[in-house]
Structures are given as C-alpha cells and as structure tokens.
C-alpha cells in the first residue's frame, strides 16, 4: 500500500513539476526590467526565451519574437535546449510511469516489468528536473553577469540588442517557476525510484532444497549446478539455480509446475 502511495505521489508531483517546466519555458518573464533606478517608468520591458515584450502604462503590450537562430547568444540557445530536453524527457517519463502505476492493470504485466518502468520513469524525471534547474540557473547567472556590467553600451545576452545602462534586467517570475518546477520533478523522480524498490519481486535464493517430481527423481544439490532428470541430455530441462541466476533457456521457456519449489 505504501509503495502504491509513494508511486502515485511521485507521479503526481512529477506531473505538476513538468507542467511547471512547460509553463516556465513558455513564459515571457524570464528577465524583467530592474526598476531600482527608475521606479516611475511608463514603459516596462521583460524578456523570455522566445520573445521580448514591452508593456506601456497605457495598457498596450507589444511582443516581438527572436526571429533569428544564428544571431542569438549561445547561452540563450543552451538554456532553450536544456528546457526542451527537460520537457521531452519529462513527457516520456510521464508516459512510461502511467503504464508503470501499480493501480493500473495492463494485460498480464508482471510486477518486475512495472518496477523496471517505474525506475526508468524515475530516472527520466530526475534528469528532466536537473535539466530545468540547470537551464534556469544558467539564465540566472547570465542575468547577474549582465546586471553588473556598467559599460555604456552592453550586450543584453538576449535578442542580440545593444543595451544602454538605462535598462537593466533582473530575475523574472519564470525563473522561480522553473526552479520550483525542476525541484518538484526531481523529487517526483526520487519518489518513483524509491517506489521501484518496493515493487520489485523478492527473488528466493535457492540453496538446498529437495522434492519429488511426479514419476521422476530429481535431486537439487547445494551450489549452482545442473540437475539431471534421468531423461538423458535434454538441455531444455537443465536449469541452473544460484541465487536467482537463470540460463538463457529459462528466460525463453515458460515455467512448468516443476520449475519452482
């Protein structure tokens, strides 16, 4: 029950986190005009990963996309890439985790398969969260660097424009959304990984067991070795038991009533 709860909570937390990462990536307020020097401006500038906007006190807002790829700073491109990778990994992780949920029955899927899928989605969520946190942090670092540049004409690091000292940019709402969302996705991923441990079926370590098979005498001796059935060299019936280790044959064949004690 605790495993199901942990898995379900991990899924929900990751879902919220990924939704937040998507929201942050789409938001225009990654950087906003610093109003410290001019708190009474009638024109407010803010910028996102995809476009820059100007809101006038009249209420009119004008946004212009960055219609160039090559003209954009490498750092901005890197942030875009990190956020997109985070979204893609997160989306795949969500898809995988839906099928991995213990409360959802899909055919005759074994717990071991669900455990593997839970672990996979958990790792994907962790990487997705790290990508988002890294992307937001790189952008924040870029802003801090630009903020303290006091040259009369400085490069904004966004949109390829020349910026005067007049307009400085500070952290926008999207950065905080991104950090929180990345953190949630990371936490969700960790929870999925924890849930995976509880989902994995505990393998029995066969050491010294003996039983009578119908019509045939089968003896299992300690250690990992082949047990003869008296039917000559029929390799299909040869098994190796050593703490759960299996031959390729066993993986391929369906278990019979004699395969397990």
């Amino acid at each position: 029950m605790a495993v199901t709860a942990c898995q379900g909570l991990g899924f929900v937390v990751s879902l919220i986190g990924i939704a937040g990462i998507i929201a942050a990536t789409c938001m225009d307020q990654w950087s906003t005009q610093d109003l410290y020097n001019n708190p009474v401006t009638a024109v407010f500038n803010y910028q996102g990963l995809w476009r820059s906007c100007v809101r006038e006190s009249s209420g009119f807002t004008e946004c212009r996309g960055y219609f160039t790829l090559l003209g954009l700073p490498a750092m901005l491109q890197a942030v875009r890439a990190l956020m997109i990778v985070g979204i893609v990994l997160g989306a795949i992780g969500l898809l995988v985790s839906i099928f991995a949920l213990k409360c959802i029955r899909i055919g005759s899927m074994e717990d071991s398969a669900k455990a593997n899928m839970t672990l996979t989605s958990g790792i994907m969520f962790i990487v997705s969260g790290l990508c988002a946190i890294a992307g937001v942090s790189v952008f924040a670092n870029m802003l801090v660097t630009n903020f303290w540049m006091s040259t009369a004409n400085m490069y904004t690091g966004m949109g390829g424009m020349v910026q005067t000292v007049q307009t400085r940019y500070t952290f926008g709402a999207a950065l905080f959304v991104g950090w929180v969302a990345g953190g949630l996705t990371l936490i969700g991923g960790v929870m999925m990984c924890i849930a995976c441990r509880g989902l994995a079926p505990e393998e029995t370590n066969y050491k010294a067991v003996s039983y009578h098979a119908s019509g045939h005498s089968v003896a299992y001796k300690p250690g990992g070795f082949k047990a003869s059935t008296g039917f000559g060299s029929n390799t299909k019936n040869k098994k190796i038991y050593d703490g759960g280790a299996r031959t390729e044959d066993e993986v391929q064949s369906y278990p019979s009533k004699h395969d397990y004690v």
Partner: antibody, heavy 119, light 113 residues
Framework: DVQLVESGGGLVQPGGSLRLSCAAS????????MHWVRQAPGKGLEWVAY????????YYADTVKGRFTLSRDNPKNTLYLQMNSLRAEDTAVYYC????????????WGQGTTVTVSS | DVVLTQSPDSLAVSLGERATINCKSS????????????LTWYQQKPGQTPKLLIY???TRKSGVPDRFSGSGSGTDFTLTISSLQAEDVAVYYC?????????FGGGTKVEIK
C-alpha cells in the same frame, strides 16, 4: 464614440478644496490608464497626474504632490481629482485624458473644466 | 525629472513652406526593449483641446495629414510640417511619455508669415 466630460470646476479661495470629476463613455474605462493635464491661462500644457487601470499605480507632478489625490470608480466609469490646499498657481483649465493609444500617447481629451483660485 | 526644451518659442512660415520644430530632452527617451522613442507630439489650435499628431517620435496617428512628420532619437527630436497650410496655425507641444512625470515641452507657436 469616446467621450470624456469634466465637471466640478469653479471659483475657490486659496487653501480651499475642490473635487473634479471626469465621466467616461464609449470605451472600456476599466482597461485604460487615465491622466489629468492642466493649462494655466495663456500658458502651456502641464501634466498633473496619472492613474493606472486598476488604480495600482498613481503618479503626480511634483507641483501637486501631497495636495492632490487621484482616484477612479471603474463601475461608474468616473475619474476623480481631489484638490486640497489650493494655490493661485493652480488656476487653470483641467483636462482629463486617456492613454487609449500606442506609445502612451494621450489620444482622447475632454473639453476641460476651469478652476479659479482667488481671494 | 525629464526636462523638454522646445525651440523656437514661435515660428512664422509662409504658406506652402516648411516648418521645423525642435524638442530636446534632458534624458534619453529611447527604449531598448522595442527600439522605440517615447516622445509624443500634440497640436493645439486656438480655443481647442490638444490633438495627438505623432507617437513613438515618428509614427503618425491615423487621420493626420502626411505633411506632418516626426524624426529623431534619444534626446533630439524634430517635428516637420513639409508644406504649411492655414489650418496648421497652432501651438505644438512635445511630451515625454517614457517616465513619470510625463512632462511637456514649453510649446512652439506656429504662425503664417
């Protein structure tokens, strides 16, 4: 058609108070910032104050700061300018105007109301 | 506060001739975000309310005759009437709409010579 109609002007003694009103129609009043601009007899235009659409931002000219109070009643489509401690230099025609256009430009203006401060 | 200085104070121009009004700002009115200058020009005819002519320093408001044009960037701006008409007799004002207080220039009176 956009219309701005000012009222409340008149003769007042120095140190007195007056409340100007501006009734707006023909546009979504609650969506736009509003301004008061005045013009003393034979003089140029002087910007007085501004209030944002939701009253979140209010700015005043240094000459009226602390004496004038700007407010708006969006459901009533009305802008108000409460003028206290009036001085002779406040004598002017007071216009209300709206930043209805791009570039913070004052696109629509009322006909103005005259305020005379004299003893 | 932004101080706008208009020159000349008055201007007498013959009909059909060019009239040029200057407006100098104490601070840059150029906004990096959208590469626009936040300066507006108004026309006030005798006994009338001001009328918007030009916004963003050079964008003519729809309905304004094309003989009116605005130019300039940063701190220096110009309003030009390419061919003065009788109905253009008025006082012209520039206004800072970049930061509060939204100051006006002193005005330039345009008359016919």
């Amino acid at each position: 058609d956009v219309q701005l109609v000012e009222s409340g002007g008149g003769l007042v003694q120095p140190g007195g108070s007056l409340r100007l009103s501006c009734a707006a129609s023909g546009f979504t009043f609650s969506s736009f910032g509003m301004h008061w601009v005045r013009q003393a007899p034979g003089k140029g235009l002087e910007w007085v104050a501004y209030i944002s659409s939701g009253s979140g931002s209010i700015y005043y000219a240094d000459t009226v700061k602390g004496r004038f109070t700007l407010s708006r009643d969006n459901p009533k489509n009305t802008l108000y300018l409460q003028m206290n401690s009036l001085r002779a230099e406040d004598t002017a025609v007071y216009y209300c105007a709206t930043s209805y256009y791009y570039g913070n430009a004052l696109e629509y203006w009322g006909q103005g109301t005259t305020v005379t401060v004299s003893s | 506060d932004v101080v706008l200085t208009q020159s000349p104070d008055s201007l007498a121009v013959s009909l059909g001739e060019r009239a040029t009004i200057n407006c100098k700002s104490s601070q840059s009115l150029f906004n990096v975000g959208n590469q626009k200058n936040y300066l507006t020009w108004y026309q006030q005819k005798p006994g009338q309310t001001p009328k918007l002519l030009i916004y963003w320093a050079s964008t003519r408001k729809s309905g304004v005759p094309d003989r009116f044009s605005g130019s300039g960037s940063g701190t220096d701006f110009t309003l030009t009437i390419s061919s003065l008409q009788a109905e253009d007799v008025a006082v012209y004002y520039c206004q800072n709409v970049y930061s509060y207080p939204l100051t006006f220039g002193g005005g330039t009176k345009v008359e016919i010579k």
